[in-house]
């Protein structure tokens, strides 16, 4: 080994070197949280970049760059260090127009903490392993969601557009003429029935067990879907999103009530099956796989 490499190895294995890097990263994180940093922090930024460059140079000199088994770029954690340094120099010395997007990558510096703290490194390793093991469960989940999304699409397509429409019109007005002029919230509130405090028109249905309209109103299929058009089963993608919402139980009872009001109470069976299969079974299966992966990593 050359004297330069021997010195680099001595520095790399020294505990003070690890401490210096850890303190630098933590200080850097504190500086990144500043709202309006003073001008002198620019020099501090250069110092941080200098320390990170020095760290990487020491590692490259001690282990080699990329040829060989244990070299710098063969360790995935060093890829992070390399990217941090490259972006630091890119944002500083290369004029790339809108640099603010690239400056976002400075946040990656905080992730360097993981490679420095051994316990954290183990946990992240376990997390990555669990993600690898999750692939099969994820495929099963996406498949199940897709199947139920297709069923939902067939059962409820267009149903959430059913609204209670006013039974009194001007002489020149017809359903279609109104449909063509509906634009503002004011227009909607003029022709449709709204429950007090509701941001969407009252839903209704055409089957006997679905929601009925109050006196003076008739159920029609007009306008957009509830929740600014985001809640529907009109396309596979929207149906998939609705099913994902059921699986994660994200305000699912509202979707349940809306759909049952528009389609009929019989369809509660669909929701029972989805909640049992998707929410109780699949979610717990995912958790079980993650738990197994952590257990394996610990052993």
């Amino acid at each position: 080994f050359s004297p330069l490499r021997r010195i680099s190895i001595k520095i790399l294995v020294h505990s003070l070197f690890s401490m210096l890097i850890m303190c630098t990263i933590l200080t850097n994180c504190i500086f990144m949280t500043m709202n309006n940093p003073p001008d002198w922090t620019k020099n501090v930024e250069y110092t941080f970049t200098g320390i990170y460059t020095f760290e990487s140079l020491v590692k490259i000199l001690a282990r080699g760059f990329c040829v060989g088994e244990f070299t710098f770029l063969r360790d995935p954690w060093n890829w992070l260090d390399f990217v941090v340094i490259v972006f630091a120099y890119l944002t500083e010395f290369v004029n790339l127009g809108n640099v603010s997007a690239l400056r976002t990558f400075r946040v990656l510096r905080a992730l360097k903490t993981i490679s420095v703290i051994p316990g954290l490194k183990t946990i992240v390793g376990a997390l990555i392993q669990s993600v690898k093991k999750l692939s099969d469960v994820m495929i099963l989940t996406v498949f199940c969601l897709s199947v139920f999304a297709l069923i939902g699409l067939q059962l409820f397509m267009g149903n959430l557009k059913h609204k209670c429409f006013r039974n009194s019109l001007e002489n020149n007005e017809t359903l279609e003429s109104i449909m063509n002029t509906l634009e503002s919230e004011e227009d909607f509130r003029k022709y449709f029935y709204y429950l007090e405090g509701s941001k969407d028109a009252l839903l209704c249905g055409f089957s006997t067990d679905s929601g009925q309209c109050p006196e003076g109103y008739t159920c029609v299929k007009i306008g957009r879907n509830p929740d600014y058009g985001y809640t529907s089963f009109d396309t596979f993608s929207w149906a998939f999103l609705a099913l994902f919402r059921l699986m994660t139980q994200d305000y699912w009872e509202n979707l349940y009530q809306q759909t049952l009001r528009a389609a009929g109470k019989t369809y509660m069976i669909f929701f029972v099956v989805v909640i049992f299969l998707g929410s109780f079974y699949l979610i717990n299966l995912i958790l079980a796989v993650v738990a197994m992966a952590y257990e394996e990593q610990n052993q």
């Epitope: 397509m157 009194s168 279609e176 449909m179 006196e215 008739t218 159920c219 029609v220 299929k221």
Partner: nanobody, 124 residues
């Protein structure tokens, strides 16, 4: 195919009467907001004559008030327009309009569904 069948038109003397009927020939008509009669005289725009809402309340054009009566038979899915004291200016093609929701089998569709029209001629 959505079909509204109008009948009862013809030639009548001023002061005479006619009864127009509009039947929904298909069970795909689910629920109307209203079913009404419109007319279009030669060279003029189509205008409302009378309409009846699904709850039974009616609405008439000023020219039809007191002379014309609109009614419905829900069992037969038919709407009638009884026209009395007819005048020459009532001469027009009378159209039936179902404004509401139909079922295509796969989905529900709301909109305006017009009949072919029946000709009413008031002449001495």
């Amino acid at each position: 195919e959505v079909q509204l069948v109008e009948s009862g038109g013809g030639v009548v003397q001023p002061g005479g009467s006619l009864r127009l009927s509009c039947a929904a020939s298909h069970r795909q008509f689910i629920r109307d907001v209203f079913t009404g009669w419109y007319r279009q005289a030669p060279g003029k725009q189509r205008e409302l004559v009378a309409r009846i809402y699904n709850e039974g309340n009616t609405q008439y054009a000023d020219s039809a008030k007191g002379r014309f009566t609109i009614s419905r038979d829900n069992a037969k899915k038919t709407v009638y327009l009884q026209m009395n004291s007819l005048r020459p200016e009532d001469t027009a093609l009378y159209y039936c309009l179902f404004s509401g929701t139909i079922s295509t089998g796969r989905e529900y569709r709301s909109g305006d569904y017009w009949g072919q029209g029946t000709l009413v001629t008031v002449s001495s």
